[in-house]
Interface confidence: low
Amino acid sequence: SAPGEDEECGRVRDFVAKLANNTHQHVFDDLRGSVSLSWVGDSTGVILVLTTFHVPLVIMTFGQSKLYRSEDYGKNFKDITDLINNTFIRTEFGMAIGPENSGKVVLTAEVSGGSRGGRIFRSSDFAKNFVQTDLPFHPLTQMMYSPQNSDYLLALSTENGLWVSKNFGGKWEEIHKAVCLAKWGSDNTIFFTTYANGSCKADLGALELWRTSDLGKSFKTIGVKIYSFGLGGRFLFASVMADKDTTRRIHVSTDQGDTWSMAQLPSVGQEQFYSILAANDDMVFMHVDEPGDTGFGTIFTSDDRGIVYSKSLDRHLYTTTGGETDFTNVTSLRGVYITSVLSEDNSIQTMITFDQGGRWTHLRKPENSECDATAKNKNECSLHIHASYSISQKLNVPMAPLSEPNAVGIVIAHGSVGDAISVMVPDVYISDDGGYSWTKMLEGPHYYTILDSGGIIVAIEHSSRPINVIKFSTDEGQCWQTYTFTRDPIYFTGLASEPGARSMNISIWGFTESFLTSQWVSYTIDFKDILERNCEEKDYTIWLAHSTDPEDYEDGCILGYKEQFLRLRKSSVCQNGRDYVVTKQPSICLCSLEDFLCDFGYYRPENDSKCVEQPELKGHDLEFCLYGREEHLTTNGYRKIPGDKCQGGVNPVREVKDLKKKCTSNFLSPEKQNSKSN
């Protein structure tokens, strides 16, 4: 029987009446057009909704937008369009919401063709009031807030100028011309690339990388012959053109670009690309595209300096530069990532790693599922997850996989069960242990979201027809109740809940269509009365993450330590609450070879945990580039995995000596850098 239909599923008591009392409809007085929604701050209940409607006239497009504000999580909305002087807001810039709980909002207005500059509306009180400011430039990008100080904004202009404001957009100053890309780093530092000759496109591969640490008073050139750059965790990456040909290589800095090391990664040609898939302060996952239009490449994982890389996964699906990859960080369990590979027969298969890229395996077949026709053996197959690539291919997949840091172990995704991803209609699967085991949760495609840190899961069927039913589960997707939230079905467009999955409110967005008009409508349902009481100690149970063999003393050890969590019992129907904090108890493990990656010049043969010397380097001194100097490495082939906390046990020896020689292979050596002041 389908999930939620078997006998042991009890019904949540009186839920229809409880939900009916907590269902709030809001009909927006708008023609349909487009709608965008932003949450302002954390746990404030403030939502801004911008509706825009375009009427194409013969000569030009006439646009109208309206701004609405809610301060009760979407139950009621107030039209505040007059606060922005009924101005048409440019949706391509969205609503720029300030970091943390700054309460800052910037809206970029549409201005007439001949104007000197653009116009913004600024609020620093959670959109209660707005100030209109005329800009001395036309913005090309959305205003970017400094992560450290929400008063500091940067923007690029349509003329490729880099503009900075130090007083939350009140006054602007152009600090550099001919800028291609700009990003905030840490400590209010700005990194940007500039072109010298024609344009960003013409100078690709000949750009300069600059840094300013004082908002444009002084500058330092930290790289030349730059193709592109990126920031990830504490790493600054630049892809740099080689001196002799059209290939380029990745260089890495961990000191804001003062010194650079060449990453031990393959170089790429003109048609290839590098992509930072994920990065934290410990390490980085890097995708390196294969030559030719193959649609795949190789994932490498870095050491703690971002310099030495280990091959992690072959034939990793990544279509083109800026294209689609299914790489997903499962945020509900440490060390877990899911992605897709393109197999030799061009089928797409899902792989999962539980140890931050050390080993990849197929997803275990769900207990309650049969292998589909893609499976050669009807008894042996795997779960394959639909993510960005399937969505880009217009498969019937309304949502990417979902996990939340505070809903420990829960992963929800569309998938099919076989030897590869199937083109047939997917079902929804859930894992409650971070991806080790899976269960079919819902038949057919659905939208889904997690509320109350996993205490409630909400889903809506993906249908081309109007809908009026929402499903919810209080036991991590085992049993489902259905609630008819309106008598008049709506054309559903999206589910919205406050980011962070702590809320108990869900908003269902859609539109109604009558003979002549269609209108936006939202239904906000508060589940607080379904979870009648606050959870107590007895509602939680101890769960050991990554546990695969309870008999083994090292069971649950991943990256050198194991973690026990307090998790809500599936049978408990209670509120974790907005202040819920994940309770975990870490304990350190003994080191084994699994806690080390292979050092520069070494590799792991397949299905072996020992690192062996690369044949071409046998008997040679291991010399490599570090911070523009040549280093001599004495190693028996192992280097601790970044973030690994193991102690005792195996302890391979490693020593690095400075050879006091300059590296000729490093294009970003210090003598090529210079400084200037404004």
């Epitope: 389908a2 027969d345 061009n346 089928s347 589909d372 026709a373 893609t374 399937s390 291919q393 217009k394 498969l395 019937n396 199937s422 083109v423 047939m424 209609v425 038949e443 057919g444 249908s463 081309s464």
Partner: antibody, heavy 122, light 107 residues
Framework: QVQLVQSGAEVKKPGASVKVSCKAS????????MHWVRQAPGQGLEWMGW????????NYAQKFQGRVTMTRDTSISTAYMELSRLRSDDTAVYYC???????????????WGQGTLVTVSS | DIQMTQSPSTLSASVGDRVTITCRAS??????LAWYQQKPGKAPKLLIY???SLESGVPSRFSGSGSGTEFTLTISSLQPDDFATYYC?????????FGGGTKVEIK
């Protein structure tokens, strides 16, 4: 316009093999799955499987696994279905039918070949 | 495998009649259902896909409805050209399966 033209009727003895061809025109051959469906005299329709002309990947119905081989020649936009170890109950009209584009849920058949009658008789 | 059961297997009707054919799936197939018409010696012709979407060029007297496990093909006013056999087909999961067919004959 889209056309699927199949090879002519065949008479085979039990235990033999038959190979039916299906030449596609009027669309990008490699962009769409090619399915094979058969129909025994006076009976309903039975799906046999598909081939992805782009990759050569196949997907056969369990019933035909081990006896059917689907191949393609992209240079001449032709798909083939070979059925081996023929039995008298394999007597049927065999159709090729164009499925949906790759990675789309559209496995209904807008375009069909004219059918090839395969008679298995001793 | 998903079984598709069509009823009736034979249906006698006259020109101008409203005709309804039913197709039942052994498990939910959402809206992933197609209807075909087949005449003797000819290949099937697609009429309806995704349960209710009319294939272009098909007369509007044909319509489809239903979702989950129960589906219906309706011919609002039977024409001489409509006497044929009709098949439903699910494409929710492999193997793709067809109903046994409904023969619409002249009364």
């Amino acid at each position: 316009q889209v056309q699927l033209v199949q090879s002519g009727a065949e008479v085979k003895k039990p235990g033999a093999s038959v190979k039916v061809s299906c030449k596609a025109s009027g669309y990008t051959f490699t962009g769409y799955y090619m399915h094979w469906v058969r129909q025994a005299p006076g009976q309903g329709l039975e799906w046999m499987g598909w081939i992805n002309p782009n990759s050569g990947g196949t997907n056969y119905a369990q019933k035909f696994q081990g006896r059917v081989t689907m191949t393609r020649d992209t240079s001449i936009s032709t798909a083939y279905m070979e059925l081996s170890r023929l039995r008298s109950d394999d007597t049927a009209v065999y159709y090729c039918a164009r499925g949906g584009p790759q990675l789309r849920v559209a496995e209904y058949f807008q375009h069909w070949g004219q059918g090839t009658l395969v008679t298995v008789s001793s | 495998d998903i079984q598709m059961t069509q009823s009736p297997s034979t249906l006698s009707a006259s020109v101008g009649d409203r005709v309804t054919i039913t197709c039942r799936a052994s498990q939910s197939i959402s809206s992933w259902l197609a209807w075909y018409q087949q005449k003797p010696g000819k290949a099937p012709k697609l009429l309806i896909y995704k349960a209710s979407s009319l294939e272009s060029g098909v007369p509007s007297r044909f319509s489809g409805s239903g979702s989950g496990t129960e589906f219906t093909l309706t011919i609002s006013s039977l024409q001489p050209d409509d006497f044929a056999t009709y098949y439903c087909q699910q494409y929710k999961s492999y193997p793709i399966t067809f109903g046994g067919g409904t023969k619409v004959e002249i009364k």
